[in-house]
Interface confidence: low
């Protein structure tokens, strides 16, 4: 037997760990797959990405809906030939998440 | 040339992306290296772990100080021979972070 308060605390923690969009730090260059002579300052931006736990090992926390948000960043080319340019960079922002099977099951597999 | 307001927004975002302790969802069983016949409910807990960006590619965001916090969880053994037990589980909680070289440099290496 467990007292109701302890169960409440455990349940609240569990709710907070579940698969949902979470603010995450994303490296812009690797996100956009930019060439090595182009880099961004700041190199990282904050966006929401799916994260957290699923109830079963066979499930993975994945995005079900995505929006793209624009971040103003300095795009710097090496060698530096002009003043660093302020550019709008579109980064994926997960707006919905769900625990889904790690690999989709095909009827003929 | 950039207007001062844009710079402020970019700088604030950069501050928020930097290496610091962030609330993270951690899987208890893999954290504790428990045997496959023991699992926990909830399977995950929220703790602070170092995360975020460093200014240089050669640096990695690592913990410089750690505390251990106790979480009340149900420990379940398979096959189920008794009532799930409420046990205190100690999980590492990063309290300080720093951008450090990816591999420590030894004077004799």
């Amino acid at each position: 037997f467990y007292d109701i308060e302890t169960l409440k605390v455990i349940d609240e923690e569990w709710q907070r760990t579940q698969c949902s969009p979470r603010e995450t730090c994303v490296e812009v260059a690797s996100e956009l797959g930019k060439s090595t002579n182009t880099f961004f300052k700041p190199p990282c931006v904050n966006v929401f990405r799916c994260g957290g736990c699923c109830n079963e090992e066979s499930l993975i926390c994945m995005n079900t809906s995505t929006s793209y948000i624009s971040k103003q960043l300095f795009e710097i080319s090496v060698p530096l030939t002009s003043v660093p340019e302020l550019v709008p960079v579109k980064v994926a922002n997960h707006t919905g998440c769900k625990c889904l099977p790690t690999a989709p099951r095909h009827p003929y597999s | 040339f950039y207007d001062i307001e844009t710079l402020k927004v970019i700088d604030e975002e950069w501050q928020r992306t930097q290496c610091s302790p962030r609330e993270t969802c951690v899987e208890v069983a893999s954290e504790l290296g428990k045997s496959t016949n023991t699992f926990f409910k909830p399977p995950c807990v929220n703790v602070f772990r170092c995360g975020g960006c460093c200014n240089e590619e050669s640096l990695i965001c690592m913990n410089t100080s750690t505390s251990y916090i106790s979480k009340q969880l149900f420990e379940i053994s398979v096959p189920l021979t008794s009532v799930p037990e409420l046990v205190p589980v100690k999980v590492a909680n990063h309290t300080g972070c720093k951008c450090l070289p990816t591999a420590p440099r030894h004077p004799y290496s």
């Epitope: 300052k41 700041p42 300095f74 003043v83 660093p84 | 040339f1 950039y2 207007d3 001062i4 970019i10």
Partner: antibody, heavy 117, light 112 residues
């Protein structure tokens, strides 16, 4: 509130090196995208942009004067320096320090430099 | 370099009159990001220049609405609808689209 203040030698002779200091407050040169620059104005004439230095230590110079200009910064002490080598009477002007944003909003009060034999 | 040509060199006006200053650039000031970085400054005797209008038409904070900017491409105009005593001084146009950033030669607004 942003303030910038220039200081210089006042008078110097032809062929000497002019050293100017800009001391600023209200912002930091370690902030992304921030820059500080120098503009000069001969008495009763127009304005000429000389150079600026960015938060990441990149420097930009007016191509016409590039070979004679050196800009540097001391971020921790909120200072930017400009050196002009081999000065001539044509370098007599009021020298302004500016915060490089788009456009120039904050200017120093200016320091008058006279090159005279 | 982009040459900025201001006319007239001197503009005598009576208080309450309208004043108009022209600024022409030797090449288009439209940046590849779509903005036109043409600005206007006023310099009073013994002072540093103060920003009036930025990006062609935008009044800087605290600038009275009697000041207005217009134009596009290479031709720009600053208008003062009713000149007041505090408006006297030298007006400069400036471009920050192309490096090096350049200024016009100035227009002196004075009482006739």
């Amino acid at each position: 509130q942003v303030t910038l203040k220039e200081s210089g030698p006042g008078i110097l002779q032809p062929s000497q090196t002019l050293s100017l200091t800009c001391s600023f407050s209200g912002f930091s040169l370690s902030t992304y995208g921030m820059g500080v620059g120098w503009i000069r104005q001969p008495s009763g004439k127009g304005l000429e942009w000389l150079a600026n230095i960015w938060w990441n230590d990149d420097k930009y110079y007016n191509p016409v004067l590039r070979s004679r200009l050196t800009i540097s910064k001391d971020t921790s002490n909120n200072q930017v320096f400009l050196k002009i080598s081999i000065v001539d009477t044509a370098d007599t002007a009021t020298y302004y320090c500016v915060q490089v944003t788009n456009p120039f909003v904050f200017w120093g009060q200016g320091t008058l430099v006279t090159v005279s034999a | 370099d982009v040459v900025m040509t201001q006319t007239p060199l001197s503009l005598p006006v009576s208080l309450g009159d309208q004043a108009s200053i022209s600024c022409r650039s030797s090449q288009s000031l439209v940046h590849n990001n779509g903005n036109t970085y043409l600005h206007w400054y006023l310099q009073k005797p013994g002072q540093s220049p103060k920003l009036l209008i930025y990006k062609v038409t935008n009044r800087f904070s605290g600038v009275p609405d009697r000041f207005s900017g217009s134009g596009s491409g290479t031709d720009f105009t600053l208008k003062i609808s009713r000149v007041e005593a505090e408006d006297l001084g030298v007006y400069f146009c400036s471009q920050s689209t192309h490096v090096p950033w350049t200024f016009g030669g100035g227009t002196k607004l004075e009482i006739e």
